[in-house]
């Protein structure tokens, strides 16, 4: 069970310092962007994180959305990675669900986040590069110190 | 980096309790877990129970249900653990730790604090 | 009597390589992950090993651990001095709620 809490706006970064947006085919992708470009992209550079209650506590549960014409939320359905048109429900009657993700810091790092998977324990939200795009994928943890497994989260409130 | 700094060492009689606190410094505070370990003199490690603030969740391990209340303060970013019914095999070093990865990775320990049960 | 069972005490020279082991069983080890600390002389724990094998920034890479089945293990290579210390390993469970530390084994450096 997973019950919703507060919720806080966001942005996202690779340890590339690239900015997480979500480009106008609802992709989430990153890019090189300077502040005032990242201003100038909102809202697609700004996600909404929000908390969950956990019923069986393994870290802070968390969704992540966005808010462009209408709300989609994050979700790695099957472990592909995508945005749905949804809103971060109150109440997740699960102890598993495709949009919570654990919301772990690095021991040793403060600043450095990780997103876990609820649904595949061992996968993590990574940025990968596929031709000229940084994408937002999920990936299996198979190397130690796997820097594309780390981010950066800025609050905006 | 996050520091915990605990209060300072108690003398106490049998039957009666006590509150150690843990005050939290330069770091996240509410969204992650502070456990209680205990360390009787000479002895291993002993988990009691956490608590993660902004959910006012508490967990304590079945040996010290009932005995122990772990509650934490978001204004001022800081735990507290109360032992009561205390006996003279709870004198231990009482840490507090913090959990930022996992509620059970006890990535950044207070310095201690040492509790005596004796009459 | 500690769930999981390490050795009281280890001992090695400078420079040389020393296990330290974890043995548990298939409820703790053989399907949770496994921490380890390190407690120096007179201090509080210290996180050395996390999720069976990841180092905390700070932790020197002479220092891994392991898992194999009910097992782990920790691997200290190039021993040095200040390595003198007590070594606990934990158990924790992914989706319930249960911890477990072994005794502790007391690492002198001859």
């Known amino acids: 069970y997973f019950g919703k809490l507060e919720s806080k706006l966001s942005v996202i970064r690779n340890l590339n310092d690239q900015v997480l947006f979500i480009d106008q085919g609802n992709r989430p992708l990153f890019e090189d962007m300077t502040d005032s470009d990242c201003r100038d992209n909102a809202p697609r550079t700004i996600f909404i994180i929000s908390m969950y209650k956990d019923s069986q506590p393994r870290g802070m549960a968390v969704t992540i959305s966005v808010k462009c014409e209408k709300i989609s939320t994050l979700s790695c359905e099957n472990k592909i990675i995508s945005f749905k048109e949804m809103n971060p429900p109150d109440n997740i009657k699960d102890t598993k669900s495709d949009i919570i993700f654990f919301q772990r810091s690095v021991p040793g790092h403060d600043n450095k986040m990780q997103f876990e998977s609820s649904s595949y324990e061992g996968y993590f939200l990574a940025c990968e590069k596929e031709r000229d795009l940084f994408k937002l994928i999920l990936k299996k943890e198979d190397e130690l110190g796997d820097r594309s497994i780390m981010f950066t989260v800025q609050n905006e409130d | 980096q996050v520091q915990l700094v605990q209060s300072g060492a108690e003398v106490k009689k049998p039957g009666s309790s006590v509150k150690v606190s843990c005050k939290a410094s330069g770091g996240t505070f509410s969204s992650y877990a502070i456990s209680w370990v205990r360390q009787a003199p000479g002895q291993g490690l002993e988990w009691m129970g956490n608590?993660?603030?902004?959910?006012?969740?508490?967990y304590y391990a079945q040996k010290f249900q009932g005995r122990v209340t772990i509650t934490a303060d978001e204004s001022t970013s800081t735990a507290y653990m109360e032992l009561s019914s205390l006996r003279s095999e709870d004198t231990a070093v009482y840490y507090c730790a913090r959990a930022a990865y996992h509620p059970l990775v006890f990535d950044n320990w207070g310095q201690g604090t040492l509790v005596t049960v004796s009459s | 009597q500690s769930v999981l069972t390490q050795p009281p005490s280890a001992s090695g020279t400078p420079g040389q390589r020393v296990t330290i082991s974890c043995s548990g069983s298939?409820?703790?080890?053989?399907?949770?992950?496994v921490n380890w600390y390190q407690q120096l002389p007179g201090t509080a724990p210290k996180l050395l090993i996390y999720?069976?094998?990841h180092r905390p920034s700070g932790v020197p890479d002479r220092f891994s651990g392991s898992k194999s089945g009910t097992s782990a293990s920790l691997a200290i290579s190039g021993l040095q001095s200040e390595d003198e210390a007590d070594y606990y390993c934990q158990s924790w469970d992914y989706s319930g709620f249960s911890t477990v530390f072994g005794g502790g084994t007391k690492l002198t450096v001859l």
């Open positions: 298939s409820s703790n080890i053989g399907n949770h992950y």
């Open positions: 999720r069976n094998n």
């Open positions: 608590i993660i603030p902004i959910t006012g969740q508490t």
